[in-house]
């Protein structure tokens, strides 16, 4: 008789999840000499231990504590790039501007990027059929709690000028319900962070509006100012040219506004 299995609304664990996490860990530690000491088997054991045999709607930040410790990484605190709803461009940017880091450029972010995972209460099985959806099922699911935990710690580590890339094509350029809006903004440390600089990325080629005047950006400015952190905002009218100019800053066309 087949065992009854909870059906969740979200997609199941990414296929070959254990192998993917382990392979990514090995690859990352090979590429980053400062992380060579990391024992990838222990990292996987800690990752697995955070959600296996636990109800996937009852995960806590504490469940991830061993993984957080084993994956400790010190990135330059003044070289942090946050992003919201514009991951691909943020990652393209840090691939060129190698001294800046998104969360996914750190070991823990790299391990989990684009993956889904969950287990089942009281069994050691990984659930490949379905996992809880944040909205339809529960917020304290393994994936959401993981990203909340690592995002909080990443924001807490930031100092000096912190940059955030925001998607100017969305109706809410700054969304209070995004990870950036609900976690990272509130965990920047005013005693360490002087300024949050938003880069609003324009979508349309002919879009010359000043999106820094958008009501949601004003809302972000208000939240940040109340936290005693300065706020600045820049329009990136031409993201393609922006990336090109990061690659080749000497190019004569890179002196004008992008």
């Amino acid at each position: 008789v087949p065992r009854w299995r909870q059906q969740w609304s979200g997609p199941g664990t990414t296929k070959r999840f254990p192998e993917t996490v382990l392979a990514r860990c090995v690859k990352y530690t090979e590429i980053h000499p400062e992380m060579r000491h990391v024992d990838c088997q222990s990292v996987w054991d800690a990752f697995k231990g955070a959600f296996i045999s636990k109800h996937p709607c009852n995960i806590t930040e504490e469940d991830y504590q061993p993984l957080m410790k084993l994956g400790t990484q010190t990135v330059p605190c003044n070289k942090i790039l946050l992003w919201s709803r514009i991951k691909d461009l943020a990652h393209q940017f840090t691939q060129v501007q190698r001294d800046m880091f998104t969360l996914e450029d750190t070991l823990l972010g790299y391990l989990a990027d684009d993956l889904t995972w969950c287990g089942e209460f009281n069994t050691s099985k990984i659930n490949y059929q379905s996992c809880p959806d944040w909205r339809k099922d529960c917020s304290n699911n393994p994936v959401s709690v993981f990203w909340k935990t690592v995002s909080r710690r990443f924001a807490e580590a930031a100092c000096d000028v912190v940059h955030v890339m925001l998607n100017g094509s969305r109706s809410k350029i700054f969304d209070k319900n995004s990870t950036f809006g609900s976690v990272e903004v509130h965990n920047l440390q005013p005693e360490k962070v002087q300024t949050l600089e938003a880069w609003v990325i324009h979508g349309g080629r002919e879009d010359s509006r000043d999106l820094c005047q958008d009501p949601t950006i004003k809302e972000l400015e208000s939240i940040i100012s109340k936290r005693n952190i300065q706020f600045s905002c820049k329009n990136i009218y031409r993201p393609d040219k922006f990336l090109q100019c990061v690659k080749n800053p000497e190019d004569s066309s890179c002196t004008s506004e992008i």
Partner: antibody
Framework: QVQLQQSGAELVKPGASVKISCKAS????????IEWVKQRPGLGLEWIGD????????NYNEKFKGKATFTADTSSNTAYMQLSSLTSEDSAVYYC???????????WGQGTLVTVSA | DIQMNQSPSSLSASLGDTITITCHAS??????LSWYQQKPGNIPKLLIY???NLHTGVPSRFSGSGSGTGFTLTISSLQPEDIATYYC?????????FGGGTKLEIK
Amino acid sequence: QVQLQQSGAELVKPGASVKISCKASGYTFSNYWIEWVKQRPGLGLEWIGDILPGSGTTNYNEKFKGKATFTADTSSNTAYMQLSSLTSEDSAVYYCAGYGNYLWFTYWGQGTLVTVSA
Amino acid sequence: DIQMNQSPSSLSASLGDTITITCHASQNINVWLSWYQQKPGNIPKLLIYKASNLHTGVPSRFSGSGSGTGFTLTISSLQPEDIATYYCQQGQSYPYTFGGGTKLEIK
């Protein structure tokens, strides 16, 4: 090789403060947590807390909040623990331990004996 | 806080004996348990990490087992240099906690 060298024994008066140092060598100091552990004479081991020198991030055992304060100086590869408002209960050997960001304590300092006495 | 109950608190055995020390966690700590040896007047030394992994340079007569809440340290063929106090420690969650210790003596 990895070494953790602690400062010497201290004899201090009740109510006073003391600052113990732990100098690390043989690895990149800023990247790895330094743990602090207390051992009272004839008794077991007690975890006080830890500090990540590169970011200054700290975790404290609730029992030692307000008693212990951790700092680190990455230019001299030294971690410090200040103990305040000392009483006879604080008389103990204090150890630093570290290297590896593991969930176990691989390398230990030689310990610093703190004696609180009038 | 996670309580670590270690037993026995003291143990007397003969040279060549096999002895077992147990550690019970008050909640699931997966495999995040380590064992330390502290000889009189010395600093603690790591013996076993991750429940069953032998630390570099530790003699193979030491072994660890267990996961979840129950763990054991076994010393086979007891040697005079094994006279020490042994501690377990959990690394699953803050605050890290140690067992009360087991003092091993030779008969």
